[in-house]
């Protein structure tokens, strides 16, 4: 039975040209995290594999930095970066947990972080 929950940074906003940290945290499970994928809609941004390290998609390598931890730092933000981001945790023996973050990139300097909050996790067994 999958008992874990994914906690994320929730809905966040940032200024155009700035940077933002996307962060998820898996709790309430003893499952081992083997890999975390970061995706923007259906596009792969990065993979952090426990044994192999990071793979940053070549399309994003100039403005995506690994970390901190299993998180991802997006740099040189544009308004086109606005949208949904997903952290997909592959775990053993539980299976897959998915967290969602919504990022809004703003033109002005009124960007501020949304409160950290927990979202329901989506999962499926393999």
């Amino acid at each position: 039975m999958m008992t874990g929950t994914i906690e994320t940074t929730g809905n966040i906003s940032a200024e155009k040209g700035g940077s933002i940290i996307l962060q998820c945290h898996l709790s309430s499970t003893t499952a081992q995290v083997t890999q975390v994928n970061w995706e923007q809609q259906d596009q792969l941004l990065a993979i952090c594999n426990a044994d192999l390290g990071w793979h940053i998609s070549p399309s994003f390598k100039d403005r995506v930095a690994p970390g901190p931890g299993l998180g991802l730092t997006l740099q040189s933000l544009t308004v086109n970066d606005t949208g949904e981001y997903f952290c997909i945790y592959h775990t053993y023996p539980d299976g897959t947990y998915t967290g969602r973050i919504f990022l809004e990139v703003l033109e002005s300097s009124v960007a501020e972080h949304g409160a950290r909050f927990q979202i329901p996790h989506h999962h499926h067994h393999h």
Epitope: I47, G53, H55, S57, H90, H126
Partner: antibody, heavy 119, light 107 residues
């Protein structure tokens, strides 16, 4: 056109070291990780390790960790694989291979470098 | 290490035949499996990654399926240039490992 051009065949004595080069062209060298894979005669492919040409960070197969060093020269768009303490079982074709867009597989391969270890 | 097995180890087929090669993995690798084609004296060529995604420039007669521990490469109608050895590889953990290969030759 993506091209990975490797250095020529080598014959080495047991205990020696070999350094194989892989010159990349047709893409931005620092945007793609590079792998090294070998294939002994009649055997399956065997992964040795990978490197991020941008940071120089590398990961190795534990089997080779004490003997293999993967490096890059960013200015020359070239990756290198050095294997030390050679033994006859290291006789193989050594390939460099570019990591794909979506994970740890390899989408383009060099032509291979034959390394023969013989006394 | 993740163990990879392939079956059959070799097969004989004719042009136009449908060919199926199986790759079995010792543990769950989700869909992180690639297939390569290698001809004698040549470098491997990527055919499929993420179990079912066709690599750029690969003919549509090649297809991949499966997830978890069982995977299949299918060639829907074998062509003369398809006679080669096919390897599966997981791309999920260290070390990355390859199957022993399946040699497809002319009947």
């Amino acid at each position: 056109e993506v091209q990975l051009v490797q250095s020529g065949a080598e014959v080495k004595k047991p205990g020696a070291s070999v350094k194989v080069s892989c010159k990349a062209s047709g893409y931005t060298f620092t945007n793609y990780y590079m792998h090294w894979v070998r294939q002994a005669p009649g055997q399956r492919l065997e992964w040795m390790g990978r490197i991020d040409p941008d940071s120089g960070g590398s990961k190795y197969n534990e089997k080779f960790k004490s003997r293999v060093t993967i490096t890059v020269d960013k200015s020359a768009s070239t990756a290198y694989m050095e294997l030390s303490s050679l033994r006859s079982e290291d006789t193989a074709v050594y390939y460099c291979a570019r990591e794909g867009h979506y994970g740890f597989y390899s989408d383009y391969w060099g032509q291979g470098t034959t390394v023969t270890v013989s006394s | 290490d993740i163990q990879m097995t392939q079956s059959p180890s070799s097969l004989s087929a004719s042009v136009g035949d449908r060919v199926t090669i199986t790759c079995r993995v010792s543990e769950n690798i989700y869909s992180y499996l690639a297939w390569y084609q290698q001809k004698p004296g040549k470098s491997p060529k990527l055919l499929i990654y993420n179990a079912k995604t066709l690599a750029e420039g690969v003919p549509s007669r090649f297809s991949g399926s499966g997830s978890g521990t069982d995977f299949t490469l299918t060639i829907s109608s074998l062509q003369p240039e398809d006679f080669a050895t096919y390897y599966c590889q997981h791309h999920y953990g260290n070390p990355l490992t390859f199957g022993p290969g399946t040699k497809v030759d002319i009947k």
